[in-house]
């Protein structure tokens, strides 16, 4: 049995330009201790979309549902979507360390942007 699952329930989300996109992610446990980060794309060129403790992400807001009992919610909302935001977004769990170590990624959610 897996000790930690990172779940991105939607494979794809389609949003009209100018609207907001909600990207859902839950983790089954806080253990191992460490942060959740959001990225667009994979590999060394991936773009950091949101980190709770570091950086400035003016268009990104955490929208977790803290009432969830059986898992932890790490969902985000990206406002004022433009075609440049299209891509696949990954919710990634890290194990705390120096530096933090990537542990497990969600399956990804593809964001497509429709014309207004």
């Amino acid at each position: 049995e897996e000790e930690l699952q990172v779940i991105q329930p939607e494979k794809s989300v389609s949003v009209a330009a100018g609207e907001s996109a909600t990207l859902n992610c839950t983790a089954t446990s806080l253990i191992p201790v460490g942060p959740i980060q959001w990225f667009r794309g994979v590999g060394p060129g991936r773009e950091l979309i949101y980190h709770q403790k570091e950086g400035h992400f003016p268009r990104v807001t955490p929208v977790s549902d803290p009432t969830k009992r059986n898992n932890m919610d790490f969902s985000i909302r990206i406002s004022n979507i433009t075609p440049a935001d299209a891509g696949t977004y990954y919710c990634v769990k890290f194990r705390k360390g120096s530096p933090d170590v990537e542990l497990k990624s969600g399956a990804g959610t593809e964001l497509s942007v429709r014309a207004k």
């Epitope: 049995e1 897996e2 000790e3 930690l4 089954t28 446990s29 806080l30 253990i31 191992p32 201790v33 460490g34 942060p35 959740i36 709770q52 403790k53 955490p62 929208v63 977790s64 803290p66 009992r69 059986n70 898992n71 932890m72 919610d73 790490f74 969902s75 985000i76 194990r95 705390k96």
Partner: antibody, heavy 118, light 112 residues
Framework: EVQLVESGGGLVKPGGSLRLSCAAS????????MSWVRQTPGKGLEWVAT????????YYPNSVKGRFTLSRDNAKNSLYLQMNSLRAEDTAVYYC???????????WGQGTTVTVSS | DIVITQSPASLAVSLGERATISCRAS??????????MHWYQQKPGQPPKLLIY???NLESGVPDRFSGSGSRTDFTLTINPLQAEDVATYYC??????????FGGGTKVEIK
Amino acid sequence: EVQLVESGGGLVKPGGSLRLSCAASGFTFSSYVMSWVRQTPGKGLEWVATISSGGTYTYYPNSVKGRFTLSRDNAKNSLYLQMNSLRAEDTAVYYCVSSMTGSSFDYWGQGTTVTVSS
Amino acid sequence: DIVITQSPASLAVSLGERATISCRASESVDSYGNSFMHWYQQKPGQPPKLLIYRASNLESGVPDRFSGSGSRTDFTLTINPLQAEDVATYYCHQSSEQLPWTFGGGTKVEIK
């Protein structure tokens, strides 16, 4: 009904060792994060150790790190705390605690008393 | 370490009145909109019992006269109206990403 039953407490001399056990029933033990929390009249509640559901990850505060070792046997629904190099300040009631997400301490056993004294 | 200052240490409230307990963390215990502060009740001779998880969520089976509020560093447990069976010691506990996890010193609630 969730049940956590601790055993193994007792009187031990400073520098000695004890092994606490916790027998779990009434829930899917292998899916839960497990911890020990201790309570003393002077210091109140103090987190002692936590282990992930599969046993891969363990965490301790500095006060017990290197002296206490937490392990689990999911086949036996059991949790163990090996306590070495015991000190007078380790005297406390030790509670076995389960946690669904590793966030809050959801269910507590009745506790077992450890007394470290010469 | 995140230090939790819980106040008051003891509280005497009349039956049917409101009891309010506060916990202040030395730094934020929030992440992704979750506040990792929890509240427990302990009656004499018994282990602690979870009342409120993640600042404001009532644990199953806990009466709704108990409520929790707050975020970041400041949190409150409210019992309204206080009943005789609520006489106990109440503890807050933070389980943020920063170890070690810590508890408040406790608040003993009595009937005035």
